[in-house]
Amino acid sequence: APVPPGEDSKDVAAPHRQPLTSSERIDKQIRYILDGISALRKETCNKSNMCESSKEALAENNLNLPKMAEKDGCFQSGFNEETCLVKIITGLLEFEVYLEYLQNRFESSEEQARAVQMSTKVLIQFLQKKAKNLDAITTPDPTTNASLLTKLQAQNQWLQDMTTHLILRSFKEFLQSSLRALRQM
């Protein structure tokens, strides 16, 4: 951080770290969540053979996980900062119900699952501060989310394991795309 005017620099530890910019803070937060996802994926892959499964399509039909598309303006071709930022925030808000689902899915990584969920809420806050066009951001309907959660929790064990794997994989891909896009902003 900078040395306050009027103060002798010897009073302040050197070298001085500037406070994080909003972009740096967002970048660090996404990486923090990605590290958490890595830990959760390790447990999922150790516990079942879902990570090598070719039957993903069966479970994927039940899920409507957020994905980046050309029209979202987050890819290098056709990049649009405002559209993309809205997509990232909307996507993260849509992922929240799936992160809630993950909360009871881990034995040894219970804390990490909670951390990923909480850190995502913080990330949304950071991004909302950055976004000017907040009107364009639609918040998922709580009733719809509640019934989706009930439906996911009622699946058989195999489908629940597959759902967990797919959520983690999709969330990782979404965050990686977001990270790339945000670095262009």
């Epitope: 951080a1 900078p2 040395v3 306050p4 005017p5 009027g6 103060e7 302040v12 530890a13 070298p15 001085h16 770290r17 406070p19 994080l20 803070r25 660090k28 937060q29 990486r31 923090y32 990605l34 590290d35 958490g36 890595s38 830990a39 990584s109 990490q112 951390a115 913080v122 501060k129």
Partner: antibody
């Protein structure tokens, strides 16, 4: 939340040394980390912080020359090496994730400097 | 180093009371101020960052405000679990500095 577990505290004589460790619950390669201390019945005092790769270290000037911060990302562990300890260094030492403010803290480890 | 002067150092209040704690920085802080709650024998918990943003899962009865050098933490309706010590922290300048704390006790 992400577990940060400090260890290495204990009783040490004035002039002695101690190395505190802070183990993270999972990979913390991309995180700035800090040490914050609290003397018994007193307020919080920032000791210093370290960048993700360990290439930038920021120490509160009052500890320069006596305390050193380091990290081993392969072990997901943060360290605080304290030399020439004084009675006034008696405190609970916390490690915390640093994004300018501290959103995740360890439970703390007590360091007592006494003869 | 930047001084963070917190007041009062302690206060007695009843459940349901509105409580206000202030923090004055010795220089302009650009809203780069956080507030923490600490209970005996526990690590501090982040409540507010950037002067007025509630950390997720922090109850809405906690709010932060302020600008320039002066910042405030308000608890709109004190609950039994809110009896604790509260600290402000500035992160505009190194070294990061904390206020000396405000102990909120039961009247």
């Amino acid at each position: 939340y992400i577990q940060l577990v400090e260890s290495g505290g204990g009783l040490v004589k004035p002039g002695g040394s101690l190395r505190l460790s802070c183990a993270a619950g999972y990979e913390f390669t991309h995180q700035d980390m800090s040490w914050v201390r609290q003397a018994p019945g007193k307020g919080l005092e920032w000791v210093g912080s370290i960048s993700p790769k360990g290439d930038h270290k920021y120490l509160n000037t009052k500890f320069i020359g006596r305390f050193t911060i380091s990290r081993d990302n392969s072990k997901n562990t943060l360290y605080l090496q304290m030399n020439s300890l004084r009675a006034e260094d008696t405190a609970v030492y916390y490690c915390a994730r640093d994004i300018d403010f501290f959103d995740t803290w360890g439970q703390g480890t007590l360091v007592t400097v006494s003869s | 180093a930047i001084q963070m002067t917190q007041s009062p150092s302690s206060l007695s209040a009843s459940v349901g009371d509105r409580v206000t704690i202030t923090c004055h920085g010795s220089y302009w802080l650009n809203s780069e101020v956080a507030w923490y709650q600490q209970k005996p024998g526990k690590a501090p918990k982040l409540l507010i960052y950037d002067a007025s943003s509630n950390y997720p899962s922090v109850p809405s009865r906690f709010s932060g405000s302020g600008s320039h050098e002066d910042y405030t933490l308000t608890i709109s309706s004190l609950q039994p679990e809110d009896f604790a010590t509260y600290y402000c922290q500035q992160y505009r300048y190194h070294p990061y500095t904390f206020g000396q704390g405000t102990k909120v006790e039961i009247k």
